[in-house]
Interface confidence: low
């Protein structure tokens, strides 16, 4: 006597109350593997979530986030508000990065500028709220006899004053 549950394909469930017949998953439910005793309820993408992939009888719906938000967590379990580059999200909303920190993305936290001197290097390009500093060659590399390097002028993005 074979266990019929093992023969139930994805998209069905082993209906134990009906002598373990393989029954199709009801509407708005799915089973992604064979031999399942129940079908799982399809995920619904509501509010700040939007549907990236519709639910089928064999696979769950997939969500992403509406514009102005980005996914967090496995399978986009949460949507978090976007901030501008040069900002980080706090409990009170988007706040500019403090001096000495930067964020070059619309998500995440502000991170400290690289400390060029720890590597014995000099600052080639100053940091901004949106960009890390660019470290240049070490002073030893600029001593007489070393190959000459002409540092470029510090980069300045339009609309941002030096910090």
């Amino acid at each position: 006597l074979q266990d019929p549950c093992s023969n139930c394909p994805a998209g069905t469930f082993c209906d134990n109350n009906r002598n373990q017949i393989c029954s199709p998953c009801p509407p708005n439910s799915f089973s992604s593997a064979g031999g399942q005793r129940t079908c799982d309820i399809c995920r619904q993408c509501k509010g700040v979530f939007r549907t990236r992939k519709e639910c089928s009888s064999t696979s769950n719906a997939e969500c992403d986030c509406t514009p102005g938000f980005h996914c967090l967590g496995a399978g986009c379990s949460m949507c978090e508000q976007d901030c501008k580059q040069g900002q980080e999200l706090t409990k009170k909303g988007c706040k500019d990065c403090c001096f000495g920190t930067f964020n070059d993305q619309k998500r995440g936290i502000c991170r400290p500028w690289t400390n060029c001197s720890l590597d014995g290097k000099s600052v080639l390009v100053n940091g901004t709220k949106e960009r890390d500093v660019v470290c240049g060659p070490s002073p030893a590399d600029l001593s007489p006899g070393a190959s000459s390097v002409t540092p470029p002028a510090p980069a300045r993005e339009p609309g941002h004053s030096p910090q």
């Epitope: 006597l1 549950c5 373990q20 005793r37």
Partner: antibody, heavy 117, light 111 residues
Framework: DVQLQESGPDLVKPSQSLSLTCTVT?????????WHWIRQFPGNKLEWMGY???????NYNPSLKSRISITRDTSKNQFFLQLNSVTTEDTATYYC??????????WGQGTSVTVSS | DIVLTQSPASLAVSPGQRATISCKAS??????????MNWYQQKPGQPPKLLIY???NVESGIPARFSGSGSGTDFTLNIHPVEEEDAATYYC?????????FGGGTKLEIK
């Protein structure tokens, strides 16, 4: 080969609880099938009592629903019958069995239980 | 509950002959094209042994002389040719509706 073995007390007093164990060898009770308890009264009438599905869900005979509980210990590959508030009417040979499609293909040898004061 | 009535209550058959056991259900045990009726053999001091499941499927290891037929409410177990070792009590059992129920049994004696 799949084998089932019932164990438990031979004698239970009226109003007490009857507890039986079915030890399964040769097949994991979490891998498939239903795992049943059936009893046979003196005079040979058979009664299906209920089962625990390999997933852990249960299904009981409505006539026993208020008194019966079937549980399992997956680490020991055992499942259990508890029947509360027994009377002399519960005197029977109790079998555990494996089943699918509503049929039972492997049975234990059975254990005889007498309810008497 | 679905009541299963077996007949005859007992019968005696000579080796090599045919034994026919009937099982009538108080309501249909059919579902989705299948009939959820099973047959068991029980010898004294032993547990029941599955012979036939879903009306006509012979369980693995059971001799081909055992066969089952029927649908709806009327089912039959046939044993042909009967052998000495077939002396036992035979039970039908339905699993289409809770609670699953058994017939009262038919005792087969070998002449």
């Amino acid at each position: 080969d799949v084998q089932l073995q019932e164990s438990g007390p031979d004698l239970v007093k009226p109003s007490q609880s009857l507890s039986l164990t079915c030890t399964v060898t040769g097949y994991s009770i979490t891998s498939g099938y239903n795992w049943h308890w059936i009893r046979q009264f003196p005079g040979n009438k058979l009664e299906w009592m209920g089962y625990i599905h390999y997933s852990g869900s249960t299904n009981y005979n409505p006539s026993l629903k208020s008194r019966i509980s079937i549980t399992r210990d997956t680490s020991k590959n055992q499942f259990f019958l508890q029947l509360n508030s027994v009377t002399t009417e519960d005197t029977a040979t109790y079998y555990c069995a494996r089943g699918a499609l509503g049929a039972m293909d492997y049975w234990g040898q059975g254990t005889s239980v007498t309810v008497s004061s | 509950d679905i009541v299963l009535t077996q007949s005859p209550a007992s019968l005696a058959v000579s080796p090599g002959q045919r034994a026919t056991i009937s099982c009538k259900a108080s309501q249909s045990v059919d579902y989705d094209g299948d009939s959820y009726m099973n047959w068991y053999q029980q010898k004294p001091g032993q547990p029941p042994k599955l012979l036939i499941y879903v009306a006509s499927n012979v369980e693995s290891g059971i001799p081909a002389r055992f066969s089952g037929s029927g649908s709806g409410t009327d089912f039959t177990l046939n044993i042909h040719p009967v052998e000495e070792e077939d002396a036992a009590t035979y039970y039908c059992q339905q699993s289409n509706e809770d609670p699953w129920t058994f017939g009262g049994g038919t005792k087969l004696e070998i002449k």
